[in-house]
Interface confidence: low
């Protein structure tokens, strides 16, 4: 099936700069399909902006200022790009790429969307390192002994912008584990967020990873925070009477 | 002109019930499609179901469409609601696939659906403290109802954050409150829930060792983040 990945979860720009958003198409040949771009401004309806067809024809929504958006595709990397020139406050939005995909019924099509990229406009120039700074919390003995389970907590601080994605995996498994998280909270000019994962006792001796996607991660790759395997048999327990 | 109207801005419904989301549209096209999408908090858009203007009412799993062509109404019903159905739902009108048009979708404003957990017996929380350096987390597990006050007890507070209270798959709640304290080793947590107080010390265990589970000896306990 056609799949769309938007590797940038956010793109932060200062006023009047140019933003370049990427959309990677897989499962389908980009030169044989049309790619569409939509935007969702805060509090507004999702709106079609521009498309590039399989033969390179570009179509823009009427009413969109000419020269504002530029759409392109690079067959070698199976990527479509949306370039937003001279960014201003009204360009703050989530931008989605999309394509039509045929369904099991003949001639039936659905439009599938990428996960979106949030365009953030800031008037500050943040020179400092604003990637997420991790702190790990290992399960308390009490929890592992009384509940035969353990909770790992992954705290991420001092990041900007606020757009962040966190998921958990067990080592040597690509399965995303069911975790929970708090809201992203503002602390001065940056943000913090935490996520926690509760695992059964039998999984405590496995390594777990808190995987963080953020615009300002070093080298643009997901940050993997390693939670070591723990052993729960080092202490004999005598729970207090409640 | 083509237009899509979703009059309900939000709707709440308990688990296991059904919810119907209304969508009206205007179009001059003789043949068209209506699509329903679910938007997750992460902003990800997931296709749910499509309704052709010349087709019988669409049905896919728990999603069904009540399509009234004359009234230009295309209501989505989600049956047997689950907690994970909480999201924003968009109705979109699809242009016919002519060579000269853009083949775009026209969206409604969306309806936010909140699925409430089923009412269940009151459950007392378990309370545990986790620490790393000056950071302390109070973990409060599996309580019902939701109302709770979490207090990290310390004489040397640096900063505290609002608690995160989230629903668990069981329909009970979990919460975490974080803070930074100079005397993190002496910090305890007390919780007011259902007119009772529960302390983290109620769950402590007698031990000759430190308060946290040991990493395996072979593991590096100073955890660098891998970039």
């Amino acid at each position: 099936a056609g799949h769309l990945e938007q590797p940038q979860i956010s793109s932060t720009k200062t006023l009047s700069k140019t933003a370049r958003l990427e959309c990677v198409v897989s499962g389908i040949t980009i030169s044989a399909t049309s790619v569409y771009w939509y935007r969702e401004r805060p509090g507004e309806v999702i709106q079609f902006l521009v498309s590039i067809s399989y033969d390179g024809t570009v179509r823009k929504e009427s009413g969109i200022p000419s020269g504002k958006f530029e759409v392109d595709r690079i067959p070698e990397t199976s990527t479509s790009t949306l370039t937003i020139h001279n960014v201003e406050k009204q360009d703050i939005a989530t931008y989605y790429c999309a394509l039509w995909e045929a369904q099991q019924e003949l001639g039936k099509k659905i439009k599938v969307f990428g996960p979106g990229t949030k365009l953030i406009i800031t008037d500050k120039q943040l020179d400092a390192d604003v990637s997420p700074k991790p702190t790990i919390f290992l399960p308390s003995i009490a929890e592992t002994k009384l509940q035969k389970a353990g909770t790992y907590l992954c705290l991420l601080e001092k990041f900007f912008p606020d757009v962040i994605k966190i998921h958990w995996e067990e080592k040597k498994s690509n399965t995303i584990l069911g975790s929970q998280e708090g809201n992203t909270m503002k602390t001065n000019d940056t943000y913090m967020k935490f996520s926690w994962l509760t695992v059964p006792e039998k999984s405590l001796d496995k390594e777990h990873r808190c995987i963080v996607r953020h615009e300002n991660n070093k080298n643009g790759v997901d940050q993997e925070i390693i939670f070591p395997p723990i052993k729960t048999d080092v202490i004999t327990m005598d729970p207090k009477d409640n | 002109a083509q237009k899509v109207t979703q009059a309900q801005s939000s709707v709440s419904m308990p688990v296991r019930k059904a919810v119907t989301l209304n969508c009206l549209y205007e179009t001059s096209w003789w043949s068209y499609y209506i699509f329903w999408y679910k938007q997750l908090p992460s902003k990800e858009m997931i296709f749910l179901i499509r309704q052709g203007s010349d087709e019988q009412n669409a049905k896919s799993g728990r999603y069904s469409v009540n399509f009234k062509k004359a009234a230009k109404s295309v209501a989505l019903t989600i049956s047997a609601l689950q907690l994970e159905d909480s999201a924003k739902y968009f109705c979109a009108l699809g242009e016919p696939n002519h060579f000269l048009n853009t083949d775009k979708l026209i969206f409604g404003k969306g309806t936010r659906v909140t699925v409430e957990p089923r009412s269940q017996p009151h459950t007392k929380p378990s309370v545990f403290v986790m620490k790393n350096g000056t950071n302390v987390a109070c973990l409060v597990k599996e309580f019902y109802p939701k109302d709770i006050r979490i207090n990290l007890v310390s004489s040397k507070k640096i900063t505290e954050f609002d608690p995160a209270i989230v629903i668990s798959p069981s329909g009970k709640y979990n919460a975490v409150k974080l803070g930074k304290y100079e005397d993190s080793n002496s910090v305890t947590c007390s919780v007011q829930h259902d007119n009772k107080t529960v302390h983290s010390t109620d769950f402590e265990v007698k031990t000759d060792s430190t308060d946290h589970v040991k990493p395996k000896e072979t593991e590096n306990t100073k955890q660098p983040s891998k970039s």
Partner: antibody
Framework: EVQLVESGGGLVQPGGSLRLSCAAS????????IHWVRQAPGKGLEWVAS????????YYADSVKGRFTISADTSKNTAYLQMNSLRAEDTAVYYC???????????????????????WGQGTLVTVSS | DIQMTQSPSSLSASVGDRVTITCRAS??????VAWYQQKPGKAPKLLIY???SLYSGVPSRFSGSRSGTDFTLTISSLQPEDFATYYC?????????FGQGTKVEIK
Amino acid sequence: EVQLVESGGGLVQPGGSLRLSCAASGFTVSSSSIHWVRQAPGKGLEWVASIYSSSGYTYYADSVKGRFTISADTSKNTAYLQMNSLRAEDTAVYYCARPYYWYPYYYWSGGWEYAAFDYWGQGTLVTVSS
Amino acid sequence: DIQMTQSPSSLSASVGDRVTITCRASQSVSSAVAWYQQKPGKAPKLLIYSASSLYSGVPSRFSGSRSGTDFTLTISSLQPEDFATYYCQQYGEYPITFGQGTKVEIK
């Protein structure tokens, strides 16, 4: 391993009825479409009917429309072809088949399912004769 | 309905020969064409889908091509196990239709 096994064929008089079954294993019929294709003795392949059990859509060849009904029981992971008002020209080996799961390019001029059939049953013979 | 006209209806060839079978669609089916091989008493086997894509496990001597509404199956070097009947199929729209078949016999 994906497998399709047809059953229910046999000798029937003109005007009679038969119900063919196609038991699937290795995949779920609810997540796929199932198609019936027949082959008269010494002749070529003829598509008969298709069902998309997730949506309930069914399609029929003109030669069987109104006489044959395709259905699926997702709990049994089985598709069926109910054949009524049978005629001599319905005599054939009936195969059920599953489409290859390779989704298509979307061309500007339209989309389609990639309904090339990669898995077929062994076939069941239906003979309509007095 | 879309007719698929297949030719020739039969051909005789020797091991090592290059064999070409063609199918003409009565109207556009884009690339929604498949080719099958069938041996007596057996179910058809998928060789080519999407006009030119080789199905997994099929020897590379089989290839498919498209020129407008004309579709071609080529066997670059005929092997003893290739003697069989070959069918084209369109699935660009319902009803799905097959060509009449081409029987490849030993010369």
